[in-house]
């Protein structure tokens, strides 16, 4: 392991579409991969009238945008589907939305998903 780098070996897994996709709904996903690739965790969710609906969580393939991020934070302004990624085991258990170039206080507090 490289000093100062948080290796990701497993992530929280969730799939809202688990019945159609015939996967588990929730669990822990081992992050396998080639030696030259870093692995991360991710979360995607929707904000429907203030209600948070998790879409997917799991391992995410080598992505410079996720390097050295210990927290899973979406910074895009009002996407249709929110996305964040991070490094470190199970770092996607909690995720949050803090849009960049936002003068006012963020409207969303950090989200801790409730178990289904």
């Amino acid at each position: 392991a490289i000093l100062g780098r948080s290796e990701t070996q497993e992530c929280l897994f969730f799939n809202a579409n688990w019945e159609k996709d015939r996967t588990n709904q929730t669990g822990v996903e081992p992050c396998y991969g080639d030696k030259d690739k870093r692995r991360h965790c991710f979360a995607t969710w929707k904000n429907i009238s203030g209600s948070i609906e998790i879409v997917k969580q799991g391992c995410w393939l080598d992505d410079i945008n996720c390097y050295d991020r210990t927290d899973c934070v979406e910074k895009k302004d009002s996407p249709e589907v929110y996305f964040c990624c991070c490094e470190g085991n199970m770092c996607n258990e909690k995720f949050s939305y803090f849009p960049e170039m936002e003068v006012t206080q963020p409207t969303s507090n950090p989200v801790t998903p409730k178990p289904p």
């Epitope: 396998y32 991969g33 991710f42 995607t44 997917k56 799991g58 995410w60 393939l61 589907v81 996305f83």
Partner: antibody, heavy 119, light 108 residues
Framework: EVQLLESGGGLVQPGGSLRLSCAAS????????MTWVRQAPGKGLEWVSA????????YYADSVKGRFTISRDNSKNTLYLQMNSLRAEDTAVYYC????????????WGQGTLVTVSS | DIQMTQSPSSLSASVGDRVTITCRAS??????LNWYQQKPGKAPKLLIY???ILQTGVPSRFSGSGSGTDFTLTISSLQPEDFATYYC??????????FGGGTKVEIK
């Protein structure tokens, strides 16, 4: 080096059967989901079937459901596609490909094997 | 099912040109969008995954952008080896992937 090598293609009559194989090397085969994608002559890419890393979950395009069966033997590092009740519209080059973790790209592909269904 | 629409279906360009290919999803696929290059008689090759992440070994003249429903593949300076067909693919509803119809890049 990751390598995928398909075999088993050929000429078959309508209603006939073929079994395609995909031999994998250069990676831990049992850790990855695998998929079959086909390409009819002069056409685009069409997803056909996929199988989870352990072989417990299988998925099919509507166009092949009930006729094709995907399977794998992790001890032999080999992926299979059993194709029954073949039709002329199944004529295509069939590729096996490795699926990586999300965003789940097909990051390595075999060279393809041609299946021709004709009388 | 999510439909993927690529445009244009073909284009003619010269070496050194900047080339842009677009891909639109019928509903949001977040960043679950991959791009492939295919040369005649060869297997597809992964270029970009996650909408913008360059696959190892792919030249930096290739770039991808977008999220949600609208995505772009850009070749900043077209090289002779780039004449090929390019496909987008959504992997949001895996394992039932859907591909775009392809864009053939031809020599002007």
């Amino acid at each position: 080096e990751v390598q995928l090598l398909e075999s088993g293609g050929g000429l078959v009559q309508p209603g006939g059967s073929l079994r395609l194989s995909c031999a994998a090397s250069g990676f831990r085969f049992g850790n990855y989901a695998m998929t079959w994608v086909r390409q009819a002559p002069g056409k685009g890419l069409e997803w056909v079937s996929a199988i989870g890393a352990s072989g417990g979950s299988t998925y099919y395009a509507d166009s092949v459901k009930g006729r094709f069966t995907i399977s794998r033997d992790n001890s032999k590092n080999t992926l299979y596609l059993q194709m029954n009740s073949l039709r002329a519209e199944d004529t295509a080059v069939y590729y096996c490909a490795r699926e990586n973790v999300a965003p789940r790209p097909l990051d390595y592909w075999g060279q393809g094997t041609l299946v021709t269904v004709s009388s | 099912d999510i439909q993927m629409t690529q445009s244009p279906s073909s284009l003619s360009a010269s070496v050194g040109d900047r080339v842009t290919i677009t891909c639109r999803a019928s509903q949001s696929v977040s960043r679950f969008l991959n791009w492939y290059q295919q040369k005649p008689g060869k297997a597809p090759k992964l270029l970009i995954y996650g909408a913008s992440i360059l696959q190892t070994g792919v030249p930096s003249r290739f770039s991808g952008s977008g999220s949600g429903t609208d995505f772009t593949l850009t070749i900043s300076s077209l090289q002779p080896e780039d004449f090929a067909t390019y496909y987008c693919q959504q992997s949001y509803t895996t394992p039932t992937w859907t591909f775009g119809g392809g864009t053939k890049v031809e020599i002007k």
